[in-house]
């Protein structure tokens, strides 16, 4: 399965649901389908309140049953470990794949944790993280932020990914804005982050 590198903000904005949850065991194959489901225990919903409506939570995460179908394989045996899951809503169920943004919550930087809880949402539908995978690359729009972690760091897990969000400076311009506590106070984001 080939997955494009994804900035956490892109994962947040492109997902129907973003939750924190624990995996409760091995997957269960769903008869007559090429799908399986993991039982999960949702601890917090970060995005998707509108999509879910009255549902109190999700008990299962659905994924293709084979890696060749881009199925997600959960390797951790630790049932108390909390994961950030960014997934899609399909037929009323949470769906994930091998390409889903799905990481242990404690592996996220404090800035990312904060951004998933409140900051990234300010950029959704307004700003676009534009991946730069080869030089030269240029901004196609003032609403784009050039993501250069892949070429500068050789990885999608770089400084912009860990510490920055692409957020509106004004209605026509998006810029990288630092997620650190010390600087965000001075940024014109109070309204967006409220």
């Amino acid at each position: 399965c080939s997955c494009a590198p994804t900035h956490p903000q892109t994962a947040f904005c492109n997902s129907d649901l973003v939750i924190r949850a624990k995996f409760m065991g091995s997957p269960e194959i769903i008869e007559t389908t090429l799908y399986q489901r993991y039982e999960i225990k949702m601890t917090k919903m970060l995005k998707g309140f509108d999509a879910v409506g009255n549902a109190t939570g999700f008990r299962f995460a659905y994924t293709p049953a084979m890696e060749s179908l881009c199925g997600y394989v959960h390797k951790s045996q630790n049932r108390s470990e909390e994961f950030l899951i960014a997934g899609r809503l399909r037929n009323g169920n949470l769906h994930i794949t091998a390409c889903s943004f799905l990481v242990p919550w404690h592996n996220l930087s404090p800035a990312q944790q904060k951004a998933f809880v409140k900051t990234y949402s300010a950029g959704c539908g307004v700003c676009t993280v534009f991946p730069c995978s080869a030089i030269p690359c240029k901004l196609e729009s003032d609403s784009h932020c050039l993501w250069t972690d892949q070429i500068l760091m050789g990885s999608e897990k770089g400084y912009q990914s860990d510490h920055f969000a692409c957020l509106p400076r004004n209605p026509d311009l998006c810029t990288w804005q630092y997620l650190g506590v010390s600087m965000t106070r001075s940024l014109p984001l109070a309204k967006a982050e409220a």
Partner: antibody
Framework: QVQLVQSGAEVKKPGSSVKVSCKAS????????ISWVRQAPGQGLEWMGW????????NYAQKFQGRVTMTRDTSISTAYMELSSLRSEDTAVYYC??????????WGQGTLVTVSS | DIALTQPASVSGSPGQSITISCTGT?????????VSWYQQHPGKAPKLMIY???NRPSGVSNRFSGSKSGNTASLTISGLQAEDEADYYC???????????FGGGTKLTVL
């Protein structure tokens, strides 16, 4: 290079059964579901069902339920499709194909099954 | 297991573009972006040309493109070449791989 090699042509009597094999090489057999598709002479492609070699789970098209059985032998990387109660309209080329997230990316060469009295 | 509807035949001259349609329902073509297209030359096994409506597998010419509007998917072949003469089949599936369905097939003739 992935290859799906099917068993040879068969001539069968009406009412009998046929079992077609599909041997995979060049990939991890249990990592890919295998689908069976048939094509009657001069006609289009018709989906019959699939088997998950990992679990042995199957799913059959409604039209073939009760007449088709798909099995596998992981030790020899081979999938099988057995069709029973054969009738003349089952005369067709039967294909196996590997299912991946992009679709049916590799196909067997096809097995001609002729049903004739 | 109702087949998707395709025109029985289409034709075009070398260098031209042609489009083959594939009409289903909101339960198959219209409901998901899981439409594939296959090319089949006489006596040969089908070959995957387009997947997920508009994506090309590696090795497939960029003369082949796919799209979808509502319950109808389309395959467009630009710059027709003699070797494009073949049968073309669309295929759709549901979300959980419970069923697949093929179109009836379209014979493409390059004049």
């Amino acid at each position: 290079q992935v290859q799906l090699v099917q068993s040879g042509a068969e001539v069968k009597k009406p009412g009998s059964s046929v079992k077609v094999s599909c041997k995979a090489s060049g990939g991890t057999f249990s990592s890919y579901a295998i689908s069976w598709v048939r094509q009657a002479p001069g006609q289009g492609l018709e989906w019959m069902g699939w088997i998950n070699p990992n679990s042995g789970g199957t799913n059959y098209a409604q039209k073939f339920q009760g007449r088709v059985t798909m099995t596998r032998d992981t030790s020899i990387s081979t999938a099988y499709m057995e069709l029973s109660s054969l009738r003349s309209e089952d005369t067709a080329v039967y294909y196996c194909a590997r299912i991946t997230y992009i679709g049916y990316d590799f196909w067997g060469q096809g097995t001609l099954v002729t049903v004739s009295s | 297991d109702i087949a998707l509807t395709q025109p029985a035949s289409v034709s075009g001259s070398p260098g031209q573009s042609i489009t083959i349609s594939c009409t289903g329902t909101s339960s198959d073509v219209g409901g998901y972006n899981y439409v594939s297209w296959y090319q089949q030359h006489p006596g040969k096994a089908p070959k995957l040309m387009i997947y997920d409506v508009s994506n090309r597998p590696s090795g497939v010419s960029n003369r082949f493109s796919g799209s979808k509007s509502g319950n109808t998917a389309s395959l467009t072949i630009s710059g027709l070449q003699a070797e494009d003469e073949a049968d073309y089949y669309c295929q759709s599936r549901d979300l959980y791989y419970v069923y697949y369905v093929f179109g009836g097939g379209t014979k493409l003739t390059v004049l």
